[in-house]
């Protein structure tokens, strides 16, 4: 398992909500990405492929999420001070092998200026 701080901007604020960006290498084909708040799983997204190369995307703990070819974004809305915490992107790489787990994270600071608007984006 590899642990570290995200070396990119992990938190992007929008109108009272936050987009939490969890990156993964372009070469990764199949994976599970979990968003952890402290030690608690808040959200997850799993991408796998079947024998016909058909893609399956699943969420056991559903959050609004967005998948690109090198990142998963999880969106949290209606921010308040209780959201301030350490957040971690827990990436399990299934494909290509070998199986590997990486954990990257950062602290989400909540400032008054980020609580003003409760619009969904």
């Amino acid at each position: 398992e590899i642990n570290g701080s995200a070396n990119y901007e992990m938190f992007i604020f929008h109108n009272g909500g936050v987009q939490i960006l969890c990156k993964y290498p372009d070469i990764v084909q199949q994976f599970k990405m979990q968003l952890l708040k402290g030690g608690q799983i808040l959200c997850d997204l799993t991408k796998t492929k079947g024998s016909g190369n058909t893609v399956s995307i699943k969420s056991l703990k559903f959050c609004h999420s967005q998948l690109s070819n090198n990142s998963v974004s999880f969106f949290l809305y209606n921010l308040d001070h209780s959201h301030a915490n350490y957040y971690f992107c827990n990436l399990s790489i299934f494909d290509p092998p070998p199986f590997k787990v990486t954990l990257t994270g950062g602290y989400l600071h909540i400032y008054e200026s980020q609580l003003c608007c409760q619009l969904k984006f």
Epitope: I27, Q29, Q30, T46, T48, K49, G50, S51, G52, N53, T54, S56, K58, F94, D95, P96, P97
Partner: antibody, heavy 117, light 111 residues
Framework: EVQLVESGGGLVQPGGSLRLSCAAS????????MDWVRQAPGKGLVWVSN????????EYSPFVKGRFTISRDNAKNTLYLQMNSLRAEDTAVYYC??????????WGQGTLVTVSS | DIVMTQSPDSLAVSLGERATINCKSS??????????LTWYQQKPGQPPKLLIF???TRQTGVPDRFSGSGSGTDFTLTISSLQAEDVAVYYC?????????FGPGTKVDIK
């Protein structure tokens, strides 16, 4: 240890039906796509069907589409193949296989289906 | 559907000698940096066993005398030093798209 055990094969008349089962153990069944692959006596391997982790995606070979239905019960760790309108050319050993992300990495011993009058 | 062909249909090789099996696909199996091509071994009376995936990566536990090579439409499985336990039928298989298909198989025997 991963184990896949097929059952339900046998002799059936043309036009008849059979339901194959595959009991899985030794791994988290609900984490994997599963497939059926068949092999006619003395012949090669032919892919039949697959199903994703929760059963929401299914795919079929053109040879069986509209006649066979794949399903799974994750609570019972069991894969199924419902075979209707069977034909003589469906005679084969049917293997249950686990799609291990980039290949069929575990196979059952197979169950023989014979379609004959 | 992608058609997989194999050559030869069968071959007999002396113990300790090299065996080479060829597989050709009717369209390229290369997507990004991966060739969606696997090799299986089937011994008499047994289910198949995964040997090689992504054209050249050995499955865990497979002896290093087995190697895979090739890209695009042309692939090769090589057994560098044939052992008695390698007598089997070998199948190539693609998972580039649906339906996945297998080659017709190549039977390997001892000369």
């Amino acid at each position: 240890e991963v184990q896949l055990v097929e059952s339900g094969g046998g002799l059936v008349q043309p036009g008849g039906s059979l339901r194959l089962s595959c009991a899985a153990s030794g791994f988290t069944f609900s984490d994997y796509w599963m497939d059926w692959v068949r092999q006619a006596p003395g012949k090669g391997l032919v892919w039949v069907s697959n199903i994703d982790e929760d059963g929401s995606i299914t795919e079929y070979s053109p040879f069986v589409k509209g006649r066979f239905t794949i399903s799974r019960d994750n609570a019972k760790n069991t894969l199924y193949l419902q075979m209707n309108s069977l034909r003589a050319e469906d005679t084969a050993v049917y293997y249950c296989t686990r799609w291990g992300r980039f290949g069929f990495d575990s196979w059952g011993q197979g169950t023989l289906v014979t379609v004959s009058s | 559907d992608i058609v997989m062909t194999q050559s030869p249909d069968s071959l007999a090789v002396s113990l300790g000698e090299r065996a080479t099996i060829n597989c050709k696909s009717s369209q390229s199996l290369l997507s990004g940096s991966f060739n969606y091509l696997t090799w299986y071994q089937q011994k008499p009376g047994q289910p198949p066993k995964l040997l090689i995936f992504y054209a050249s990566t050995r499955q865990t536990g497979v002896p290093d005398r087995f190697s895979g090579s090739g890209s695009g439409t042309d692939f090769t499985l090589t057994i560098s030093s044939l052992q008695a336990e390698d007598v089997a039928v070998y199948y190539c298989h693609h998972h580039y798209n649906a339906p996945p298909t297998f080659g017709p198989g190549t039977k390997v025997d001892i000369k």
